[in-house]
């Protein structure tokens, strides 16, 4: 069977939405009303990996695009990127590790930890209109907590 994928949107704990910023970057900013239609819809796939009640391995693709969030080393630093894939082969149950995030939910907080780089998380800045990035600190200035809104396919 193919991997099960569900559509969702994400907002950070400051209620910033995620939108495209150029072809290969996401940024976070506050949206209201009609502008909410700009927000990125993810296709979240439930992939193979270590799982518990609080931790579920997922891949985050952009709905109806052959782009996936992935974590790679750039200049020796774990970095978040949007990577283009062959739509004939993706998504799949056994995703390469760079595409896998541990979706961790504890006490109303939802985090996305890189499976490739433990303790590195999808992050946003406090500032408006800044890129979404992979951050190595929790509980600091940068935001690593999100809420998720599933949407009908």
């Amino acid at each position: 069977a193919p991997v099960r994928s569900l559509n969702c949107t994400l907002r950070d704990s400051q209620q910033k939405s995620l939108v495209m910023s150029g072809p290969y970057e996401l940024k976070a900013l506050h949206l209201q009303g009609q502008d909410m239609e700009q927000q990125v819809v993810f296709s979240m796939s439930f992939v193979q990996g270590e799982e518990s009640n609080d931790k579920i391995p997922v891949a985050l693709g952009l709905k109806e695009k052959n782009l996936y969030l992935s974590c790679v080393l750039k200049d020796d630093k774990p970095t978040l990127q949007l990577e283009s894939v062959d739509p004939k082969n993706y998504p799949k149950k056994k995703m390469e590790k760079r595409f896998v995030f541990n979706k961790i939910e504890i006490n109303n907080k939802l985090e996305f930890e890189s499976a490739q780089f433990p303790n590195w998380y999808i992050s946003t800045s406090q500032a408006e209109n800044m890129p979404v990035f992979l951050g190595g600190t929790k509980g600091g200035q940068d935001i690593t907590d999100f809420t998720m809104q599933f949407v009908s396919s």
Epitope: R4, N53, E105, N108, L110, T147, M148, Q149
Partner: antibody
């Protein structure tokens, strides 16, 4: 014994609001995703709201999106459904159920609370 | 949305009969299918999930089968307490939807 008990149903006029509650016992509430499922008189079942175990994830079908809000208080083992701008077609028995988006099915159900929207 | 169509809508059978209820999805749901039993005036009860796995405490006379778009709930030997309406539900993609129900009566 695993149990879910709904309350808060009643008769309400169109356009008004109602808040349903669901009290749980017999299991660790904070570890489970929860949902509300409704059944109109003589009709089938419709899933109307979902919330993840910690409360960070939600889902609403288009029929209730923007009007219904699901929430939970894990310290009190209680699930809520805030229903605003009620319509005649929202008339149904509302069931609290354990389960949701990830697991996909509902393995524990409450006895239901009836909601009638009528002028 | 994936539509779930159950057949028949109602049926009558005798105690001891083998009873079959079918559920057809409007698209492939890859065994992401559940069956529920709802006795009159009560809440639904989970019978089967993932198309063929029996839920805890469900008698072994109930079984599920099928694949792709077509699924079946079978009661091998009908008992008086099985009088109920039976619903299928898929959970392949959102929204997860239910069939319209099959009302089972005893002749």
């Amino acid at each position: 014994e695993v149990q879910l008990v709904e309350s808060g149903g009643g008769v309400v006029q169109p356009g008004r609001s109602l808040r349903l509650s669901c009290s749980s016992s017999g299991f660790i509430f904070s570890r489970y995703d929860m949902s509300w499922v409704r059944q109109a008189p003589g009709k089938g079942l419709e899933w109307v709201a979902y919330i993840s175990h910690g409360g960070a994830g939600t889902y609403y079908p288009d029929t209730v999106k923007g009007r219904f809000t699901i929430s939970r208080d894990n310290s009190k083992n209680t699930l809520f459904l805030q229903m605003d701008s009620l319509r005649a077609e929202d008339t149904a028995v509302y069931y609290c159920a354990r389960g949701g988006v990830y697991k996909g099915y509902f393995d524990v159900w409450g006895q239901g609370t009836p909601v009638t929207v009528s002028s | 949305d994936i539509q779930m169509t159950q057949s028949p809508s109602s049926l009558s059978a005798s105690v001891g009969d083998r009873v079959t209820i079918t559920c057809r999805a409007s698209g492939n749901i890859y065994d992401y299918l559940t069956w529920y039993q709802q006795t009159p005036g009560k809440a639904p009860k989970l019978l089967i999930y993932n198309a063929k796995i029996l839920a805890d405490g469900v008698p072994s006379r109930f079984s599920g089968s099928g694949s792709g778009t077509d699924y079946t709930l079978t009661i091998s030997s009908l008992q008086p307490e099985d009088i109920a309406t039976y619903y299928c539900q898929h959970f392949w993609m959102l929204p997860y939807t239910f069939g319209q129900g099959t009302k089972l009566q005893i002749t």
